[in-house]
Interface confidence: medium
């Protein structure tokens, strides 16, 4: 079975100071699959973020960075420029 | 704060065995995430990985020399232990030991390398 | 294997002036790559990751630059303390490699 596995349940970040977000691959090789990015909000809205490869959910391309990381079986999420309106709950799911 | 120190030998003779081990403070290596790493300096020559070991005894050997290697780790006395057999002349080199971080995944602390010669 | 070369070997410069180091991978190591500081009879001390990231403790007069294949350490105003040999790193796929170095010297 494949499941995917956030880093870090919590990760702290300092606003402008660049912050990484990551999902370990456990069963599977992470490059046989899509990467997909979302973040819930309070309002328990899911919104897209960013799916393999270069595509970007409206007003996340400027701040963030998806990124797969083959040789640590990771997806991966930069957030530039981390502000207020960045908390939430992030999400990383894989499809083919 | 993190520290690392390497042992092991200064003068090992042609097709010893060489064991080096790294006794670090600061970190722990059940931490999800952490390594420990060799990497090795000729005289007057560029850095070589040589092997890492992470927090789930995974094990990852530079292919050049894997059949040489052996890095193993225990967790209850902050040690790494590296082995390479069959040493030769251009073995001598300085051994370092890096915690690699699990935030990073590069080496952002490292020994201060010990010395060791091969030679008859 | 990724090999990774730099260049200029040799860079010799007066304090003051403005130190471009390069980094070239043989194939895409997109953003996982590193930059290290050593100064003889030391060991390296990690200065950039991820291409751009300062790691903690280096002044902002270092920083990073590329992604893919060509990289770029700039050094905005030479220190005293800045003469070193300067190695790259990619941790984009197994075995990890370094750069065979350049040397900063002063002119």
């Known amino acids: 079975a494949i499941e995917l596995v956030p880093e870090h349940q919590t990760v702290p970040v300092s606003i402008g100071v660049p912050a990484t977000l990551r999902c370990s691959m456990k069963g599977e090789a992470i490059g046989n699959y899509y990467i997909n990015w979302y973040r819930k909000t309070q309002g328990n809205t899911m919104t897209f973020i960013y799916r393999e490869k270069d595509i970007y959910g409206p007003g996340f391309k400027d701040n963030f960075q998806g990124d797969i990381d083959i040789a640590k079986n990771l997806a991966v999420l930069k957030i530039l420029a981390p502000s207020e309106r960045d908390e939430g709950s992030y999400y990383c799911a894989c499809d083919t | 704060q993190v520290t690392l120190r390497e042992s092991g030998p200064t003068l090992v003779k042609p097709t010893q065995t060489l064991t080096l081990t790294c006794t670090f403070s600061?970190?722990?290596?059940?931490?999800?995430?952490?390594?420990v790493g060799w990497i090795r300096q000729p005289p007057g020559k560029a850095l070589e990985w040589l092997a890492l070991?992470?927090?789930?005894?995974?094990?990852r050997y530079n292919p050049s020399l894997k059949s040489r290697l052996t890095i193993t780790k225990d967790t209850s006395k902050n040690q790494v232990v590296l082995t390479m057999t069959n040493m030769d002349p251009v073995g001598t080199a300085t051994y370092y030991c890096?915690?690699?971080?699990?935030?990073?995944?590069?080496?952002?602390?490292w020994g201060q390398g010990t010395m060791v010669t091969v030679s008859s | 294997e990724i090999v990774l070369t730099q260049s200029p070997a040799t860079l010799s410069l007066s304090p003051g002036e403005r130190a471009t180091l390069s980094c070239r991978a043989s194939?895409?190591?997109?953003?996982?790559l590193a930059w290290y500081q050593q100064k003889p009879g030391l060991a390296p001390r990690l200065l950039i990751y991820d291409a751009s990231n300062r790691a903690t403790g280096i002044p902002a007069r270092f920083s990073g630059s590329g992604s893919g294949t060509d990289f770029t350490l700039t050094i905005s105003s030479l220190e005293p303390v800045d003469f070193a040999v300067y190695y790259c790193q990619q941790r984009s796929s197994w075995p990890w490699t370094f750069g065979q170095g350049t040397k900063v010297d002063i002119k």
């Open positions: 070991i992470y927090w789930n005894d995974d094990k």
């Open positions: 890096s915690h690699e971080s699990d935030w990073s995944y590069y080496f952002d602390y």
């Open positions: 600061g970190f722990s290596l059940s931490t999800y995430g952490v390594g």
């Open positions: 194939q895409s190591v997109s953003s996982y």
